[in-house]
Each structure stands twice: as structure tokens, then as C-alpha cells.
């Protein structure tokens, strides 16, 4: 017996173009949670029941509200580990599915709406009792960084948690460095010693003196990342330049990408571009299917007819969503606006409005321009369910009551100096520049580079 532990480090936009918009908005704050599903990783066991090794759901993360105009950051995460206890032997090779879910708040507080943001999967080799393994997985434009490990629960020990070792209360007859082991209590077990120099992060052993590598690492001591070296034999010490005497196989030679994936070299290794329906480091993981148990709340899973829809969930009454993840109640239609809380009183629904809003559906903005005065000659502007004061020159703040520093935004270009003035600001330009904001260079012949009329 033991526990698989998953630590999510970050979830946010991946590198490259097409960065996703934040899943939360100012009008619709949300929070994240994660679901992990584990299965034994051998292909002949693929037909096993969903999440045969177990599954876990994280706590909800902190509420996040998008800052308008800001790029989507890494999103705030739930505290703690996801722990999946396993009763039997740890299989050594396992498959995982990690889902990132969004719980929408705001209008839906009366009945939270859940939606699946990203799903990653992979197959890994992992010895119980080993160190944390780090991983990065991408799902569309999102990137998930996480670590995982499997550890045995006492009295289980070993790379599969199958041997029992219990300490004795009586003084041990075993010598130093040895420990008593049950059920063979008369025998003393030496702690497993791997080959000298075997990487503690990337290697493990099941027999004394061996060094077996975790996925992505190679070499006699598991210290070489797979496919990082293009050299079969390095140049001799006399050569100052790096390179190869004999051109070795490149990282894409022999195409490490399965299932029709195309390989491209990267500075450190290679990258597979997978066809639709496959993903993983080498396109080795096919799209999620009914065997992965993607339907929540008793939904019936039916295999889809095309690769774009590997499965369809038929939801029981009271649930909807592509994974039957949304509970349907009378607040699900979101009658309350502007972040109001929907309350089902039985005979009717009522909205409890946030401060600043009123009306049966919280549709009235109490702070709108109708009863709003902007000081110092400012004018009230409504829009998008909100309002603001457009302040006269020299004033700022919510109600234009604060004197603004017109120089705070450094309006003078090219090193010009800014001076606050009762009517606004004045720029004193550095030599060679002119204009109200010092924006135009003065050419040596005296003509300024003003834009053509």
C-alpha cells in the first residue's frame, strides 16, 4: 500500500503565440481545481475500469479575477498535494490524466458552473520511494507544471511497496545499516544500494548495484537527458570547438514521435507535433476515451464517431456539460446580474445583490451617472455596466477630487523635463528636440522633422 502524490506548481499560458485569455474575468471571477486519474500503464491493462489505480480531486484554489488588459498570468492554485492512495502493489509504469477545472463564480454562485479548461495525459515509469519527478505538459495554449512521486505507507517498502518491513521494539540483532524485516523477522535486510553514481533524481534500482532510468533519461548513471547529445564520440581534448568527429544521430533520427507525429529538433532535444487525437512527449497518448472515465456524476460514456470527439457523455437528469460536470438547478440559468447571489427559496428565486446594485435581478447600478456628481468640472461616463468620471485637466481620482500630477506619466519625450502648470503641463525639451511633448527632432539644418500635412 502507498500514496501517489501530485504537486501542481503552475497552470498558465504556455509559450508561443496564441496565448489564451484568462479563464476568469472581472465580471465572472473563478477559481481552479484539479482532478487526477491514475491507471496501470501497461497496454494490456488499458481496458481496465477507469482510474483503476485511483483518482483524487484537489481543493478549490483562491478566487481569481482578471485584471482588464493584463495578459493571462499563472493562475492561483489550490493549496496542498493531490493524494491518490493505492492498496495493492505500485505498478512501476502508470498512466495519468490531470484535468484542470474552472469553477465560475459571480452570477452562478447559487449553483457553481464548472468547465474543463485543460486535460493532459501521459505514461510514465516511476519507482515507489524515489524522489519527486518534475514534468511539464501542454494542453492547447495552456501549460501545466507539476511534480509527482509514489511513496509506500509503512510497513510497506520497496519500489512496488510489496515487501513489509516493520521496526521492532526489541533491540535489533541486525548490524549497523541493516534493518529487521517482516515476515522474515530473523533475517536482516540491507537497504537497497544502487550502482555508485546512479542519479538520485533520474535513476532507481530494484536490485542492488543496478541503475534503471526514469523516462526521458539515459546513460549508465541516468544522467544524460534523452537525445540531448548529437555526438557519438566527442572531439578529443585538443579540440577547442565542440562538435562531432562522426556525425551522430540527431534527436529526430528514426522519428521518436509515434502515431504519425512529426519531429522537430529543439536546442536541447526534440519536439513532436502530434496528429489530432494524440498527445504526450512522443504522441504516445491517444485522446481521452471512455476507458479514462471522463463523465462525472454518473454520466454514461459513449465513444465518439470521430477523432475530434473521442467520447460523448450522456448526462443523468440534473447534470449537463460535456463531462456532466454542471449541476442543473434553478439558479443555473443565472438570473442574478452583476455578481448577485442566486438563492432558491423553494417557491421562487431571489437575488442577493452586491454592494452598489439593486433590483430583483440586481440590474440597477446604484452608482450610475443618474445620481453621481464628478467634481472639478469632470463629466460622468457610463459603459459596460460601470461608470467613471472623466476628469478635467489637472484632476483625477474616482470623483475628480484629487489633484493629478500631470507629469506622473512622463509625457515629455526624448529626455524633456516636465513642469506642472495650472493649466496642465509644460515640457522643456532637450537640445535637438521640439514640440509640445518634445516629440520632433530638430535637424541640423534647422528644419524640424514635423509630420507632413
Amino acid at each position: 500500500a502507498g500514496v501517489f502524490e501530485l504537486q501542481i506548481h503552475s497552470f498558465g499560458p504556455g509559450p508561443g503565440p496564441g496565448a489564451p485569455r484568462s479563464p476568469c474575468s472581472a465580471r465572472l471571477p473563478c477559481r481552479l481545481f484539479f482532478r487526477v486519474c491514475l491507471k496501470p500503464g501497461l497496454s494490456e491493462e488499458a481496458a481496465e475500469s477507469p482510474c483503476a489505480l485511483g483518482a483524487a480531486l484537489s481543493a478549490r484554489g483562491p478566487v481569481y479575477t482578471e485584471q482588464p488588459g493584463a495578459p493571462a498570468p499563472d493562475l492561483p492554485l489550490p493549496d496542498g498535494l493531490l493524494q491518490v492512495p493505492f492498496r495493492d502493489a505500485w505498478p512501476g509504469t502508470f498512466s495519468f490524466i490531470i484535468e484542470t477545472w474552472r469553477e465560475e463564480l459571480g452570477d452562478q454562485i447559487g449553483g457553481p458552473a464548472w468547465s474543463l479548461l485543460a486535460r493532459v495525459a501521459g505514461r510514465r515509469r516511476l519507482a515507489a520511494g524515489g524522489p519527486w519527478a518534475r514534468d511539464i505538459q501542454r494542453a492547447g495554449a495552456w501549460e501545466l507544471r507539476f511534480s509527482y512521486r509514489a511513496r509506500c505507507e509503512p510497513p510497506a517498502v520497496g519500489t512496488a511497496c510489496t515487501r513489509l518491513c516493520r521496526p521492532r521494539s526489541a533491540p535489533s540483532r541486525c548490524g549497523p545499516g541493516l534493518r529487521p524485516c517482516a515476515p522474515l523477522e530473523d533475517e536482516c535486510e540491507a537497504p537497497l544500494v544502487c550502482r555508485a553514481g546512479c542519479s538520485p533524481e533520474h535513476g532507481f534500482c530494484e536490485q542492488p548495484g543496478e541503475c534503471r532510468c526514469l523516462e526521458g533519461w539515459t546513460g549508465p548513471l541516468c544522467t544524460v537527458p534523452v537525445s540531448t547529445s548529437s555526438c557519438l564520440s566527442p572531439r578529443g581534448p585538443s579540440s577547442a570547438t565542440t562538435g562531432c568527429l562522426v556525425p551522430g544521430p540527431g534527436p529526430c533520427d528514426g522519428n521518436p514521435c509515434a502515431n504519425g507525429g512529426s519531429c522537430s529538433e529543439t536546442p536541447r532535444s526534440f519536439e513532436c507535433t502530434c496528429p489530432r487525437g494524440f498527445y504526450g512527449l512522443r504522441c504516445e497518448v491517444s485522446g481521452v476515451t471512455c476507458a479514462d472515465g471522463p463523465c462525472f456524476n454518473g454520466g454514461l460514456c459513449v465513444g465518439g464517431a470521430d477523432p475530434d470527439s473521442a467520447y460523448i457523455c450522456h448526462c443523468p437528469p440534473g447534470f449537463q456539460g460535456s463531462n456532466c460536470e454542471k449541476r442543473v438547478d434553478r439558479c443555473s440559468l443565472q438570473p442574478c446580474r452583476n455578481g448577485g447571489l442566486c438563492l432558491d427559496l423553494g417557491h421562487a428565486l431571489r437575488c442577493r445583490c452586491r454592494a452598489g446594485f439593486a433590483g430583483p435581478r440586481c440590474e440597477h447600478d446604484l452608482d450610475d451617472c443618474a445620481g453621481r456628481a464628478c467634481a472639478n468640472g469632470g463629466t460622468c461616463v457610463e459603459g459596460g455596466g460601470a461608470h467613471r468620471c472623466s476628469c478635467a485637466l489637472g484632476f483625477g481620482g474616482r470623483d475628480c477630487r484629487e489633484r493629478a500630477d500631470p507629469c506622473a506619466a512622463r509625457p515629455c519625450a526624448h529626455g524633456g523635463r516636465c513642469y506642472a502648470h495650472f493649466s496642465g503641463l509644460v515640457c522643456a525639451c532637450a537640445p535637438g528636440y521640439m514640440g509640445a511633448r518634445c516629440e520632433f527632432p530638430v535637424h541640423p539644418d534647422g528644419a524640424s522633422a514635423l509630420p507632413a500635412a
Epitope: D329, S332, L333, P335, G346, H347, L349, R361
Partner: antibody
Framework: EVQLVQSGSELKKPGASVKVSCKAS????????MNWVKQAPGQGLEWMGI????????IYNHKFKGRFVLSVDKSSNTAYLQISSLKAEDTAVYYC?????????????WGQGTTVTVSS | DIQMTQSPSSLSASVGDRVTITCHAS??????MGWLQQKPGKAPKGLIY???NLEDGVPSRFSGSGSGADYTLTISSLQPEDFADYYC?????????FGGGTKVEIK
């Protein structure tokens, strides 16, 4: 005066699509949900689904998922029911019916109904 | 889904008769139900909401009562214009469901 005016009768071939409209007037369109109800010839009433015109959020009867899509156009105060891949069993009268979004009232006003006939 | 069992499925009555139609829900619906009237070739029309409240413009001879899972529509003195189909509907839970209908015919 509250009125829900539906589009006219439709005769369609199997496999075709149809879009039934329901134009609302006399009340604030976004304050009331819109229900859609099917009545097959000689049969009773069957609830298909509901849409919140303010947010566009929909809930469907699980018997009417997939080929049936509810939508609204707030600018014209119109709700729509679209049915694709029509089958003979879709032959029916389809009604829109408004409902207060806080459920203080049931379906108080109904459209006159749109007859959809599916026949080869 | 909540089943709405309506009875009788049809009845014959004379003008001036007192008519009672019942509806039983498969679970408690806390008064979240209504009664509709439908005349041949016409759209349904709301009569009663929340089990007992008359919609605007509905004559006072119509009344509704009940709680929990059992509800009743009563027409105290049947009028010629009342010959029609009557349906109960629950809106306590999605999907909304209708009773099978009661046809009120002239005896």
C-alpha cells in the same frame, strides 16, 4: 400588451433544418426566460428547453439535446429554436412561452405556435 | 425527471357543474406548478401559478389548491367557454414536465 409572435408554418424534407422565431414585445425581453414546448399531433405538451435572453445560458431537456439549439437576438427581442437533421417525428407544433426569470410565475404568455411538418 | 400524473384523462360535464382535476407529482414540488388551458387549434394559456394563484384576467371560478406532491384544479361552475384541454406543469426542477392532460367535454 405582452405578445409573442412566432414565424409561420414550415414544410421540410427529412434531413433539412428549420429555424423557428418568436418575437417578443410589450415587456423587457431580458427579464423573462423563454421556454420552448413541443406538441406532436394529437399529443400532450413536452418541454424542450429554456434560455435566459440576458446571458444566453440554456438548459435543455435531455430528450432534446444535440439537434436542437436555442438562441436569442437581444437587439430584435427575438428567440429562436433551430432543429437540424429533421426527422418525421419532429412533425409538431412548437410553442415559445415566457417565464419570469425569478420563477414568480409559470409560463404566463405563449406564442401562437409554429407548425413544422417533416415529410418526404 | 419528475413525473406528473394527471387524472382523469377526460371527463364529461354540463354547464354549471363543479369540475375537479388532480395532478400528482412523483416527488414533492413545493407548489412550483401551474395549470394551463388549451382550446383546439390554439396555444396554451396560463390559468394558475404556484399551485393556487390566478394569472391576470382569469375568472375567479377557477381555483387551485394543494401542496407537496398533490394538486387540484377546480372549476366551480363550468361555463361553455371552459370546454378545453387542461394540463398541469411542474417547474420545481429541470426538465419541466407536463401532466398528460384532461379533456373536459360537454355531456
Amino acid at each position: 400588451e405582452v405578445q409573442l409572435v412566432q414565424s409561420g408554418s414550415e414544410l421540410k424534407k427529412p434531413g433539412a433544418s428549420v429555424k423557428v422565431s418568436c418575437k417578443a414585445s410589450g415587456y423587457t425581453f431580458t427579464d423573462y426566460y423563454m421556454n420552448w414546448v413541443k406538441q406532436a399531433p394529437g399529443q400532450g405538451l413536452e418541454w424542450m428547453g429554456i434560455i435566459n435572453p440576458y446571458s444566453g445560458v440554456t438548459i435543455y431537456n435531455h430528450k432534446f439535446k444535440g439537434r436542437f439549439v436555442l438562441s436569442v437576438d437581444k437587439s430584435s427581442n427575438t428567440a429562436y429554436l433551430q432543429i437540424s437533421s429533421l426527422k418525421a417525428e419532429d412533425t409538431a407544433v412548437y410553442y415559445c412561452a415566457r417565464q419570469d426569470s425569478l420563477l414568480d410565475y409559470a409560463m404566463d404568455y405563449w406564442g401562437q405556435g409554429t407548425t413544422v411538418t417533416v415529410s418526404s | 425527471d419528475i413525473q406528473m400524473t394527471q387524472s382523469p384523462s377526460s371527463l364529461s360535464a354540463s354547464v354549471g357543474d363543479r369540475v375537479t382535476i388532480t395532478c400528482h407529482a412523483s416527488q414533492g414540488i413545493s407548489g412550483n406548478m401551474g395549470w394551463l388551458q388549451q382550446k383546439p387549434g390554439k396555444a396554451p394559456k396560463g390559468l394558475i401559478y404556484h399551485g393556487a394563484n390566478l394569472e391576470d384576467g382569469v375568472p375567479s371560478r377557477f381555483s387551485g389548491s394543494g401542496s407537496g406532491a398533490d394538486y387540484t384544479l377546480t372549476i366551480s361552475s363550468l361555463q361553455p367557454e371552459d370546454f378545453a384541454d387542461y394540463y398541469c406543469v411542474q417547474y420545481a426542477q429541470f426538465p419541466y414536465t407536463f401532466g398528460g392532460g384532461t379533456k373536459v367535454e360537454i355531456k
